[in-house]
């Protein structure tokens, strides 16, 4: 869990000829906000399409009224932070709109008027806890400037915010392997190692320390291919009779991968693994650069400016390949026992387990309350087979052991401030905000909300409505 | 898509009472915010009432005691009782809703509410 942060620093005239009108005039004086959409991974979804990861609206900036005769200048914004709470693993790669809203202040009588005045969007890469990343985008004649950061919630931490950070067993210091947890220095992490050397590419692991292999890879370090290993070594694939398997004719045979590209065989056919700068299904595209979007399932072009320089793909999780062109589906050996989910994280895998049973691969049966131990003052209920344990106020997971944060789950609309109280949270509002979550505004001033729209017209398109 | 249609204004005497009902579809009621406001003739809109997706109510001081929000999950409706009605209530009532997953609040067209002997 984590919250991604927005922060706008300018709205106003982008360089150049052709300075946009002012938004406001001095008949009607407006007001700006901001909402920001966020959906997983670098897709060019439409801009209608869910808010997969989450959504957020500011608070209303001050009221401007244009100066006649001056130039448009940098807009007045609202104050503070768009806050996007994510529940579950940050994605690293992820794709954003930014929308300008005006929020015209005349007397309107019948409906509200409330338009878009500049929508941009994008996708980038982001590892959770790093540094502010600013970024300018420019739509029309209008240019935002803004940064934006992920950033994870205790006790999660690490750049997808999935490691959990546990309180010492010992007071001293942290057991094998396990560092202390920035910067909860008083608690360790509990990082998921594999072993060393084992490749990021083609291997994985479910314990600390080890190395498993993906399909069409193997070694110790998963970095040899299948196909050109079978019968290399004495410890190759073999059979009780002959001690190693031969295969006939196989699609690989003659190599049918051009330009330095290997060969693996699949089910049906063989797939060609091509080097940089090559791409195809024989890896007989060549001179490819960033600008041909050589990357595929949302990868991430690095280099390559010009045909005779390489470039990379630093592909989502759940890709593989030097174009991203290959799924990861670990999924599919369906390591979660008794009805557990199983989620793929890309650099691990999870297994969400129903209700009485747990451990990592749902492997543990919990019947009843004997033995266990529910902390912070939290009490064990079972029922059905199952058992959990019901946290005291300001504890939450499993075993009570981590410190709930309300605000989290839970934020605040139109720019309110999010406090975790002993009864849950309080959201302090802007002004002119009421409710709990402050989302209702006590004077729209008839325009901050979307009329039912018209049919063929949906929420969100930058109409005018009056 | 989130539509709300309103239904239940009408002509009521200063003293006597009047529910409206806020039909939702697209999405459960129970993912969002919901609010009444009103619109009197030349006067800005107004917040009345507002129920929270957890359930929590808030109330404006003038109808406090006297109009009360309310949610039924399995009719997807909203409804808001209100009593005790006085001239100064007559207005064009609003369903407002704000749905949490993508931030955006939406509007219905409005009821009106006359009170008047």
């Known amino acids: 869990a984590g919250v991604f942060e927005l922060q706008i620093h300018s709205f106003g005239p982008g360089p150049g000829p052709g300075a946009p009108r002012s938004p406001c005039s001095a008949r009607l004086p407006c007001r700006l906000f901001f909402r920001v959409c966020l959906k997983p991974g670098l897709s060019e979804e439409a801009a209608e399409s869910p808010c997969a990861l989450g959504a957020a609206l500011s608070a209303r900036g001050p009221v401007y009224t244009e100066q006649p005769g001056a130039p448009a200048p940098d807009l007045p914004l609202p104050d503070g932070l768009l806050q996007v709470p994510f529940r579950d693993a940050w994605p690293g790669t992820f794709s954003f709109i930014i929308e300008t809203w005006r929020e015209e202040l005349g007397d309107q009588i019948g409906g509200p008027a409330w338009s878009l005045l500049a929508r941009v969007a994008g996708r980038r890469r982001l590892a959770a806890g790093g540094p502010w990343a600013r970024d300018i985008q420019r739509a029309g004649a209008w240019e935002l400037r803004f940064s934006y950061r992920a950033r994870c919630e205790p006790p999660a931490v690490g750049t997808a915010c999935t490691r959990l950070c546990r309180p010492r067993s010992a007071p001293s210091r942290c057991g094998p392997g396990l560092r202390p947890c920035a910067p909860l220095e008083d608690e360790c992490e509990a990082p998921l190692v594999c072993r060393a050397g084992c490749s990021p590419e083609h291997g994985f692991c479910e314990q600390p320390g080890e190395c498993r292999c993906l399909e069409g890879w193997t070694g110790p370090l998963c970095t040899v291919p299948v196909s050109t290993s079978s019968c290399l070594s004495p410890r190759g694939p073999s059979s009780a009779t002959t001690g190693c398997l031969v295969p006939g004719p196989g699609p690989c045979d003659g190599n049918p991968c051009a330009n330095g590209g290997s060969c693996s065989e699949t089910p049906r056919s063989f797939e060609c693994t091509c080097p940089r700068g090559f791409y195809g299904l024989r890896c007989e595209v060549s001179g490819v650069t960033c600008a041909d979007g050589p990357c595929f399932n949302g990868g991430l072009c690095v280099g390559g400016a010009d045909p005779d320089s390489a470039y990379i793909c630093h592909c989502p999780p759940g890709f593989q390949g030097s174009n991203c062109e290959k799924r990861v589906d670990r999924c599919s050996l369906q390591p979660c026992r008794n009805g557990g989910l199983c989620l793929d994280l890309g650099h691990a895998l999870r297994c969400r387990c129903r209700a009485g049973f747990a451990g990592p691969r749902c492997e543990h049966d919990l019947d009843d309350c004997a033995g266990r131990a529910c902390a912070n003052g939290g009490t064990c209920v079972e029922g059905g087979g199952a058992h959990r344990c019901s946290c005291a106020l300001g504890f939450g997971g499993r075993d009570c052991r981590e410190r709930a944060d309300p605000c989290a789950a839970r934020p605040c609309a139109h720019g309110g401030r999010c406090y975790a109280h002993f009864s849950g949270l309080v959201c302090a509002c802007a002004p002119g905000y009421m409710g709990a979550r402050c989302e209702f505004p006590v004077h729209p001033d008839g325009a901050s909300a979307l009329p039912a729209a018209p049919p063929g017209l949906r929420p969100g398109d930058p109409q005018r409505y009056l | 898509e989130v539509q709300l249609v309103e239904s239940g204004g009408g002509l009521v005497q200063p003293g006597g009472s009047l529910t409206l009902s806020c039909a939702a579809s697209?999405?459960?009621?129970?993912?969002?915010?919901i609010a009444w406001y009103r619109q009197a003739p030349g006067k800005k809109r107004e917040l009345v009432a507002g129920?929270?997706?957890?359930?929590?109510?808030v109330y404006v001081d003038s109808v406090k005691g006297r109009f009360t929000i309310s949610r039924d999950n399995a009719k997807n409706s909203v409804y808001l009782q209100m009593n005790s009605l006085r001239a100064e209530d007559t207005a064009v009532y609003y369903c407002y809703a704000y749905e949490w997953t993508n931030a955006l609040p939406y509007w219905g067209q409005g009821t009106l509410v006359t009170v008047s002997s």
């Open positions: 129920i929270s997706d957890d359930g929590s109510t």
């Open positions: 697209g999405t459960a009621v129970s993912n969002l915010s």
